[in-house]
């Protein structure tokens, strides 16, 4: 399955929207910095596109879940958030189209399940952090920056896979 060119453009638009969503300077939130344990190795160890698709799908699904809570709606600009949802939704559709073509997710191998669980654990730590910080503006800014970083890393993986094939 070849992900359409629009998928790459969508990823870039997603990053751009995340950047535009910034409301306060991260420098004013240095005391709130936190390591969420992004499982980077799960995005670097897979050499087959078929193996990465379920992991990328989980990553985008969890970003969608994180930003579609009522706490998130209160933290961000509604117009930007709506555009952000649209981009993520399109990317999920692209990845699911690959699944339907028989690549990846429906029969996830056990080793891929472990990668998916690593991604879930990472997002659970993010949600725990937000709860602990009572969804403060600084906490959301730390999370926004973290998602930009981790999404960018996973996007880079997609690009490197495309260039290999």
């Amino acid at each position: 399955c070849d992900l359409p060119q629009t998928h790459s453009l969508g990823s870039r638009r997603t990053l751009m929207l995340l950047a535009q969503m910034r409301r306060i300077s991260l420098f004013s939130c240095l005391k709130d910095r936190h390591d969420f344990g992004f499982p980077q190795e799960e995005f670097g160890n897979q050499f087959q596109k078929a193996e990465t698709i379920p992991v990328l799908h989980e990553m985008i699904q969890q970003i969608f879940n994180l930003f579609s809570t009522k706490d998130s709606s209160a933290a961000w600009d509604e117009t930007l958030l709506d555009k952000f949802y649209t981009e993520l939704y399109q990317q999920l559709n692209d990845l699911e189209a690959c699944v339907i073509q028989g690549v990846g997710v429906t029969e996830t191998p056990l080793m891929k399940e472990d990668s998916i669980l690593a991604v879930r654990k990472y997002f659970q730590r993010i949600t725990l952090y937000l709860k602990e910080k009572k969804y403060s503006p600084c906490a959301w800014e730390v999370v926004r920056a973290e998602i930009m970083r981790s999404f960018s890393l996973s996007t880079n993986l997609q690009e490197s896979l495309r260039s290999k094939e």
């Epitope: 499982p39 969890q62 080793m111 472990d114 669980l117 879930r120 654990k121 730590r125």
Partner: antibody
Framework: EVQLVQAGAEVKAPGESLRISCKVS????????ISWVRQIPGKGLEWMVK????????IYNPSFQGHVSISVDKSITTVYLQWSSLQASDTAIYYC???????????????WGQGTLVAVSS | DIQMTQSPSSLSASVGDSVTITCRAS??????FHWYRQKPGKAPELLIY???NLQTGVPSRFTGSGSGTECTLTITSLQPDDFATYYC?????????FGQGTKLDVR
């Protein structure tokens, strides 16, 4: 096959230190939380603490914080529970458990070790 | 802490019977309810997760339902293996907590 294999029973005197172990196999060690659960003989279950083996990030039950500590050795896929000074009230069976996380990030304990009996008596 | 209260604390039944155990949480835990069975001298084992999902390998005679502050575990057509202690658990809030247990024995 997922396995959590715990060390054998321990008999200790009050004030002694102890470390019990849980060796895991059959899955990617760093992908799942591990918790310890206490069961006082004839009583119910109490969740104590959980750890992310990837970087040893921990969350404690406040009832146990400061009295026990959890740690991991990634090189041998083993999780530990440690006491620096045991009390008679620590007499219990201790289970290590693996967490599964659903897509909506609900934790549940899908695999349990066989348990380690710790008896503290003078 | 979220308190989990099981009822009854014990019950007697015969092979082939159906039984229902109820668990109440002191505040809403959504569907973050789970059920475990513990046979004498053994570690607990997962039966039902997220209130109503049957764990792989668990017989379909076990069913879970409910959400919010109350959930139930129903066992139909009791088998000799089912005489054990049952625990509910919530993982909605820290610390995670269990019910006090329901001991199911042979009438």
């Amino acid at each position: 096959e997922v396995q959590l294999v715990q060390a054998g029973a321990e008999v200790k005197a009050p004030g002694e230190s102890l470390r019990i172990s849980c060796k895991v196999s059959g899955y990617t060690f760093t992908s799942y939380w591990i918790s310890w659960v206490r069961q006082i003989p004839g009583k119910g279950l109490e969740w104590m603490v959980k750890i992310d083996p990837r970087d040893s990030y921990t969350i404690y039950n406040p009832s146990f914080q400061g009295h026990v500590s959890i740690s991991v050795d990634k090189s041998i896929t083993t999780v530990y529970l440690q006491w620096s000074s045991l009390q008679a009230s620590d007499t219990a069976i201790y289970y290590c458990v693996r967490h599964y996380l659903t897509q909506s990030l609900v934790d549940y304990f899908d695999h349990w070790g066989q348990g380690t009996l710790v008896a503290v008596s003078s | 802490d979220i308190q989990m209260t099981q009822s009854p604390s014990s019950l007697s039944a015969s092979v082939g019977d159906s039984v229902t155990i109820t668990c109440r949480a002191s505040q809403s835990v959504s569907n973050y309810f789970h059920w475990y069975r513990q046979k004498p001298g053994k570690a607990p084992e997962l039966l039902i997760y997220s209130a109503s999902n049957l764990q792989t390998g668990v017989p379909s005679r076990f069913t879970g339902s409910g959400s919010g502050t109350e959930c139930t575990l129903t066992i139909t057509s009791l088998q000799p293996d089912d005489f054990a202690t049952y625990y509910c658990q919530q993982t909605h809030g820290y610390p995670f907590t269990f019910g006090q247990g329901t001991k199911l024995d042979v009438r």
